[in-house]
């Protein structure tokens, strides 16, 4: 049966690989981050914000954030030539649950942890921050970049990838096995790149009520009659019921909600209240915590970060601190344990084990891989041509083909423009990163779907504000030209 991605499911993961960090070229560059300070080590923080607008530095990382492990300890040798600075191992990964926006701001911070004789333990300071506004389609190759921040130079690569069953450049399409071999269900198309599968309905906004909400476009949440609220979880009051409280009104026959746990907002100090079954939960602003955000005046010296969280900033009671939580914990003070197994990451009936520091999947016989994603029989000895990858499932192999190729074994050249995806006379180009539309004058959008009024405003509210007429809204990747 077709189903929407549930609130807990991941749409995908943004991945960042730091290649090098060190003094930039030219005079005046520092020899090392530890000069005259004793030993130190580096770590990185990545912050993702949606859209391409210049957002205030303190605005939240609405798409997510992640913190690297600490790098190896580095001690400067005064006479020796400056080596490459040792970096933390591994990728920085930022999971996202909603559609990948394609346009985003990427903020990478390099932090120094000084390990000298600090009163109260190590000291942290921000060495460099780079901010790049980028277009990036999910599912493409690694994009490479080099950025300078003051006297420092950072080299890195990044990509966004979807977590199956989500696919597409925004991770908004779902693939499900076909109900019949020859066709998909009503209104559903074959699901590129997995042509053997069918597209599921669009992915609604995270948290949209499965009983009372629905969506026609990814990321929206439209309510059935009688329900309201951003997630369609609030019973709607009809005009004749206004002013009444209690479970129902015999005179009007309409249902009205009783007192809710968030009525009157029990969260202090600007905290926001969200209802939970039979109770409520406060999300506290920086500098406050507690059940009702009632605890304040906290600094990092008070140790507000639980479960091994890293406290940054907040040197005095007037400045806010931030807790960077280790994997498996969340909340403004890392007080909430994430039940990562609720995301059902183990495929093919594998058993999920949350070990705290890591997730493990115990696979059923015949399956293997970190998430039990490999069917040991399906892809053995099968080759997908032209850079395609073998995808297992249902006892039969199929190929997920690289851009520009199709067919069972990816041997057929596919033209991404063959379906004429650019509306209103727009031109489609078979760019290496995916199709690109150049719109005819008077139209805009990634598929030229929005007419532009003479005042430069799109006729549809779905068009992002500030978009120029004819803006392709497309995303690219650094890659070789074919």
């Amino acid at each position: 049966e077709q189903k929407l991605i549930s609130e807990e499911d991941l749409a995908g993961v943004f991945e960042l690989q730091i290649h090098s960090f060190g003094p930039g070229p030219g005079p005046g560059a520092p020899r090392s981050p530890c000069s005259a300070r004793g030993p130190c080590r580096l770590f990185f923080r990545v912050c993702l914000k949606p859209g391409l607008s210049e957002e205030a530095a303190e605005s939240p990382c609405a798409l997510g954030a992640a913190l690297s492990a600490r790098g190896p300890v580095y001690t400067e040798q005064p006479e020796a030539p400056a080596p490459d600075l040792p970096l933390p191992n591994g990728l920085l990964q930022v999971p996202f649950r909603d559609a990948w926006p394609g346009t985003f701001s990427l903020i990478i911070e390099t932090w120094r942890e000084e390990l000298g004789d600090q009163i109260g333990g190590p000291a942290w300071s921000l060495l460099a921050r780079v901010t790049r506004r980028r277009r990036l389609a999910a599912g493409g190759p690694w994009a490479r970049d080099i950025q300078r921040a003051g006297a420092w130079e950072l080299r890195f690569s990044y990509r966004a990838r979807c977590e199956l069953p989500a696919v597409g450049t925004a991770c908004t399409r779902l693939c499900r096995p076909r109900s019949a071999p020859s066709r998909c269900g009503p209104g559903l198309r074959p699901c590129a790149p997995l042509e053997d599968e069918c597209e599921a309905p669009p992915v609604c906004r995270a948290g949209c009520s499965l009983e009372h909400g629905f969506c026609e476009q990814p990321g929206e949440c439209r309510c059935l009659e009688g329900w309201t609220g951003p997630l369609c979880t609030v019973p709607a009051s009809t005009s004749s019921c206004l002013g009444l409280r209690g479970p129902s009104s015999a005179t009007t026959g309409c249902l009205v909600p009783g007192p809710g746990p968030c009525d009157g907002n029990p969260c202090a100090n600007g905290g926001s209240c969200s209802e939970t079954p039979g109770s409520f939960e406060c999300t506290c602003p920086r500098g406050f915590y507690g059940l009702r955000c009632e605890v304040s005046g906290v600094t990092c010296a008070d140790g507000p970060c639980f479960n091994g969280g890293l406290c940054v900033g907040g040197a005095d009671p007037d400045s806010a601190y931030i807790c960077h939580c280790p994997p498996g914990f969340q909340g403004s003070n890392c007080e909430k344990r994430v039940d990562r197994c609720s995301l059902q990451p183990c495929r093919n009936g594998g058993l999920c084990l949350d070990l705290g520091h890591a997730l493990r999947c115990r696979c059923r016989a015949g399956f293997a891989g970190p998430r039990c994603e490999h069917n040991l029989d399906d892809c053995a000895g099968r080759a997908c041509a032209n850079g395609g990858t073998c995808v297992e499932g249902g006892g039969a192999h199929r190929c997920s083909c690289a851009l520009g190729f199709g067919g069972r074994d990816c041997r057929e050249r596919a033209d991404p423009c063959a379906a004429r995806p650019c509306a209103h006379g727009g031109r489609c180009y078979a760019h290496f990163s995916g199709l690109v539309c150049a719109c005819a004058p008077g139209y805009m959008g990634s598929r030229c779907e929005f007419p532009v009024h003479p005042d430069g405003v799109s006729a549809l509210p779905a068009a992002p504000p500030g978009l120029r007429p004819g803006d392709p809204q497309r995303h690219h990747h650094h890659h070789h030209h074919h």
Partner: antibody, heavy 119, light 110 residues
Framework: QVTLRESGPALVKPTQTLTLTCTFS?????????MGWVRQAPGQGLEWMGT????????DYASWAKGRVTISVDTSKNQFSLKLSSVTAADTAVYYC???????????WGQGTLVTVSS | DIQLTQSPSFLSASVGDRVTITCQST????????LSWYQQKPGQPPKLLIY???NLEIGVPSRFSGSGSGTDFTLTINSLEAEDAATYYC??????????FGGGTKVEIK
């Protein structure tokens, strides 16, 4: 190997029509591109002449070239061609064919062919 | 007609210098960033350096960078090297499927 190669006469007389051919290999016009012609007079800058869009074979020309330039495609021979009518000495230039695959840039160029207009 | 104006038309600089070339268009380029930069050496076709205003083409040294949007764009060579002696062109793509090149900037090594 994806390549473009221009060919045609090195010398043309004034008032005649210049015909140049661009032969491509390593890709097919079944995908959608702009195939364009760009010229460069000796010691001068680059000048866009026109393009043909392989999605529907529509053509676009620089304003100065309209009425003088015709670009067409022969898919069976993997070629596209440029016709420039009523040439004068001012049309003496290196002529390049180039391919655009999106985002407005020519990512693939031929080596160019020098055409001299002289009687 | 759309005009792309490059300045300066000629510059002489020393190895290690930071060089900046500007490109101004009489109309906004398509999507506000469909502008590219090329390097051309005598007897060779142009070589793509930067596309979409700021994206470095694969294989191009990182000392080259591009910025700008709409009508005003900049190419920067951070630390000039001898092999960078060449002529540099900007090129825009415009609504209505037209292209235009700048007049070029010749960079000479002192």
């Amino acid at each position: 190997q994806v390549t473009l190669r221009e060919s045609g006469p090195a010398l043309v007389k004034p008032t005649q029509t210049l015909t140049l051919t661009c032969t491509f290999s390593g890709f097919s016009l079944s995908s959608s591109y702009d195939m364009g012609w760009v010229r460069q007079a000796p010691g001068q800058g680059l000048e866009w002449m026109g393009t043909i869009y392989t999605g529907d074979y529509s053509t676009d020309y620089a304003s100065w070239a309209k009425g003088r330039v015709t670009i067409s495609v022969d898919t069976s021979k993997n070629q596209f061609s440029l016709k420039l009518s009523s040439v004068t000495a001012a049309d003496t230039a290196v002529y390049y064919c180039a391919r655009h695959t999106g985002y407005g840039y020519f990512g693939l160029w031929g080596q160019g062919t020098l055409v001299t207009v002289s009687s | 007609d759309i005009q792309l104006t490059q300045s300066p038309s000629f510059l002489s600089a020393s190895v290690g210098d930071r060089v900046t070339i500007t490109c101004q268009s009489t109309e906004s380029v398509y999507g506000s960033d469909w502008l590219s930069w090329y390097q051309q050496k005598p007897g060779q076709p142009p070589k793509l350096l930067i596309y979409q205003a700021s994206n470095l083409e694969i294989g191009v040294p990182s000392r080259f960078s591009g910025s700008g949007s709409g009508t005003d764009f900049t190419l920067t060579i951070n630390s000039l090297e001898a092999e960078d002696a060449a002529t540099y062109y900007c090129q825009g793509y415009y609504s209505g499927y037209s292209y235009a090149f700048g007049g070029g900037t010749k960079v000479e090594i002192k």
